[in-house]
């Protein structure tokens, strides 16, 4: 091995300046006893190498690239060998950013899977291999003093979410919680969160369901439905309130939403709609008075609107 | 400090009738659920019935089905059992509790003994 | 209905002893998996909610593990007043099912 490249850092911020010294010791007898050192970046002969013959014999040559603006080039050191170039030593120069602080982070409990899942906006791109970590740990207060540290979570590549499972929560307790990013060039954290992972549940939607007729009760009126809902059953004991929407099933017309509902109504007369009309219906659900999520909207039902007895189908579409 | 307190147990004849009620304290009664569970001489526990924090859903075991009603106060923060048509094999010790919200229960009151025997 | 089977039914253990007790669901029941401990002529204490949570005011040497179908309440080391009965209890679902306890008892 003839020649070795130095560079004063192989990582640059985008647009910067970089120096390198390739070195071509004296026993490559076989080369011109003063060869000329030249300097390629990517396909392109770079002019301004200043050359040296050093005390110990070897040959130097120094060059300054005023501007990386190359995201990934190889540079490298050649001298011309007959009518060829000879490359002697070559490295790999990066250019990027560091990472901006990741934003938007928001955490959600699930308690079928039973972890908390957290994403976040990564910010721009930094052209860099760049990792994100969230971190954590429990508090017992407002996370102003830290407790046990939680494992930290690495998310799959090019993922901005990442699942904390239950072994590491503690429900009904604080939690402090933020990303940090970090490339070559530096690191960077996200604002903290601190929450209490019950505070951030989101629940599985009730089941909507027509209301079975019975002999005693009335039909519904013209341009009314009767529904019912089957709540999801893991949640039963989380107090909730509800909220329904329906649209008619043709045309144009957008969603109107009826709420607040208590889960526990558990059924309903929607009145107020056009008499013999196929509408469609969801509902869904957030705790409440405490905090939380909405839950998803429902599968949706289909009924119509009749001056008889109504007529219904089920109709399940899952977003 | 949470305080549940039951009474009205004590010896009925099978075919009888009898009323627990459970005293809550030290928590705002009407945003919990509440239960009763209870246990034969010497045996395990048993889910017997619970109720929603106002009172709109009221899910009971098989083996009280058509027999018991749980019930609650909101106003005067009591959960109440009415139980008919006892049984001998409703004798035990009933306890009511408060439901967390993911269903468990915590804390206990000290529980009530129902004897049903002639 | 979901049956709740514990395992073993009861157990001698000497103080200082790490004692595990197992709980199985009939079917899947995610974390909703709570455990209590009963002393003779009290009310149950509830010990871990959730699977693994302890309970307020509970010693850390009892800690629970599982989900799905297969629970472990553990002591890590048994001190006098542990000797009790122990119940889980699963949550999923309504009929609320307690399993058939576990005595521990002194060696």
């Known amino acids: 091995e003839c020649g070795h490249i130095s560079v004063s850092a192989p990582i640059v911020h985008l647009g910067d300046p970089i120096t390198a010294s390739c070195i071509i010791k004296q026993n490559c007898s076989h080369l011109d006893p003063e060869p000329q050192i030249l300097w390629r970046l990517g396909a392109e002969l770079q002019p301004g190498g200043r050359q040296q013959r050093l005390s110990d014999g070897t040959q130097e040559s120094i060059i300054t690239l005023p501007h990386l603006n190359h995201t990934q080039a190889f540079l490298s050191c050649a001298l011309n060998w007959g009518n060829s170039l000879q490359i002697l030593d070559q490295v790999e120069l990066r250019a990027g950013y560091p990472p901006a602080i990741p934003h938007n982070l928001s955490c959600l409990m699930n308690l079928t899977t039973s972890s908390l899942i957290c994403q976040w906006e990564p910010g721009p791109e930094t052209h860099l291999p760049t990792s994100f970590t969230l971190k954590s740990f429990k508090s017992r207060g407002n996370c102003q003093t830290q407790g046990d540290s939680i494992l930290d979570c690495v998310p799959k590549d090019g993922q901005s979410h990442c699942s904390i499972p239950r072994k590491h929560l503690l429900l009904y307790q604080n939690m402090g919680i933020w990303v940090q990013a970090e490339n070559a060039l530096g690191t960077s954290m996200s604002p903290q969160l601190c929450l209490d992972p019950m505070d951030v549940v989101k629940l599985e939607p009730p089941m909507l369901r027509t209301m079975d007729p019975s002999p005693e009760a009335a039909p519904p009126q013209a341009g009314c439905l009767q529904l019912s809902w089957e709540p999801w059953q893991p949640g039963l004991h989380i107090n909730q309130k509800c909220e329904l929407r329906h649209k008619p099933q043709r045309g144009e017309a957008s969603w109107a939403l009826v709420g607040p509902l208590p889960l526990e109504a558990l059924q309903y007369e929607l009145c107020g709609l056009l008499p013999a009309t196929a509408y469609t219906l969801q509902i869904r659900c957030i705790r409440w008075p405490l905090p939380g999520h909405w839950s998803d909207w429902s599968p949706s039902l289909e009924l119509r609107t009749t001056e008889r007895a109504p007529t219904h189908h089920h109709h399940h579409h899952h977003h | 400090e949470v305080q549940l307190l039951e009474s009205g147990g004590g010896l009925v004849q099978p075919g009888g009738s009898l009323r627990l009620s459970c005293a809550a304290s030290?928590?705002?009664?009407?945003?919990?659920?509440m239960g009763w569970v209870r246990q034969a001489p010497g045996k395990g526990l048993e889910w017997v019935s619970s109720?929603?924090?106002?009172?709109?859903?009221?899910p009971y075991a098989d083996s009280v089905k058509g027999r018991f009603t749980i019930s609650r106060d909101n106003s005067k923060n009591t959960l109440y059992l009415q139980m008919n048509s006892l049984r001998a094999e409703d004798t035990a010790v009933y306890y009511c509790?408060?439901?967390?919200?993911?269903?468990?229960?915590?804390?206990w009151g000290q529980g009530t003994l129902v004897t049903v025997s002639s | 209905d979901i049956q709740m089977t514990q395992s073993p039914s009861s157990l001698s253990a000497s103080v200082g002893d790490r004692v595990t007790i197992t709980c199985r669901a009939s079917?899947?029941?995610?974390?909703?998996l709570n455990w209590y401990q009963q002393k003779p002529g009290k009310a149950p204490k509830l010990l871990i909610y959730?699977?693994?949570n302890l309970q307020n005011g509970v010693p850390s040497r009892f800690s629970g593990s599982g989900s799905g179908t297969d629970f472990t309440l553990t002591i890590s080391s048994l001190q006098p007043e542990d000797f009790a009965t122990y119940y889980c209890?699963?949550?999923?679902?309504?009929?609320?099912?307690f399993g058939g306890g576990t005595k521990v008892e002194i060696k």
């Open positions: 030290g928590f705002t009664f009407s945003l919990y659920w």
């Open positions: 509790a408060k439901l967390g919200e993911l269903g468990w229960f915590d804390p």
């Open positions: 079917q899947g029941i995610s974390s909703y």
């Open positions: 109720i929603s924090s106002s009172g709109g859903v009221t």
């Open positions: 959730y699977a693994s």
């Open positions: 209890q699963q949550s999923w679902e309504y009929p609320l099912v």
